[in-house]
Amino acid sequence: QGWQAFRNDATEVIPGLGEYPEPPPENNQTMNRAENGGRPPHHPYDAKDVSEYSCRELHYTRFLTDGPCRSAKPVTELVCSGQCGPARLLPNAIGRVKWWRPNGPDFRCIPDRYRAQRVQLLCPGGAAPRSRKVRLVASCKCKRLTRFHNQSELKDFGPETARPQKGRKPRPGARGAKANQAELENAY
């Protein structure tokens, strides 16, 4: 039995972050506020400028369950969400308008880094507690998928996109946000 799929009840999003950044200043402004709206004079794609792209992260909190067993402590992790695109071209909170070219490359926000965490499970009926290892999403990243490539092949975003990835095993993280649940791994 695997973990129950979580229900994504998060209500706000935060800008994409590296694995362990400094907390942003208190007065920082997010890119999807109205004051950042308005179409810029020109908006070329520049795959080399990683800073121009934005990947949104949600956090959520839940208890993990495995059948009748439940984690002794709740966990928190990230869910990768939203449309990746040049930061200045992301839709603002009012218009919800996409300004990037419809025939441009497709960008996806998917898990990038994971953190392994050992979790204690408490089971009913006086059963002994169990220990399991789970993988929790630690950061998200934009990946590029062009129309000229196989739809299932996600390319790393940034300067390394030109490198072919043949022979590379697909990571389990390359899934939709709704599948970003903690995964059981063999802990025995």
């Epitope: 209500t11 928190t76 953190r115 979790v119």
Partner: nanobody, 118 residues
Framework: EVQLVESGGGLVQAGGSLRLSCVAS????????TGWFRQAPGKEREVVAS????????YYADSVKGRFAISRDNAKNAVYLQMNSLNLEDTGVYYC???????????WGQGTQVTVSS
Amino acid sequence: EVQLVESGGGLVQAGGSLRLSCVASGRTLRRYVTGWFRQAPGKEREVVASISWSGESTYYADSVKGRFAISRDNAKNAVYLQMNSLNLEDTGVYYCAEAELPGTYDYWGQGTQVTVSS
């Protein structure tokens, strides 16, 4: 070692409001989430709401959406839970906890009792 102290609990009539506070000290985590949890008599502890270190990301359990609001004041190392339209099902001990993101909630306060009467 993170220490968390909750306050603001008490007895309130159904439909009323309360504001809980959680003050942290000794924090060493750089990227963390603070959550509120509650436990009613004879029931398991459940998630109420959580908020990221910057205050920009929040999460609410379905049962409290639209009624509760979580916020934080990093200058005071405090997290608040504004509870409105309280009902009998909101009765319980409310705990504040912190977790590294991602990770388990390893740091817990002692809890504050909230009792909603009819």
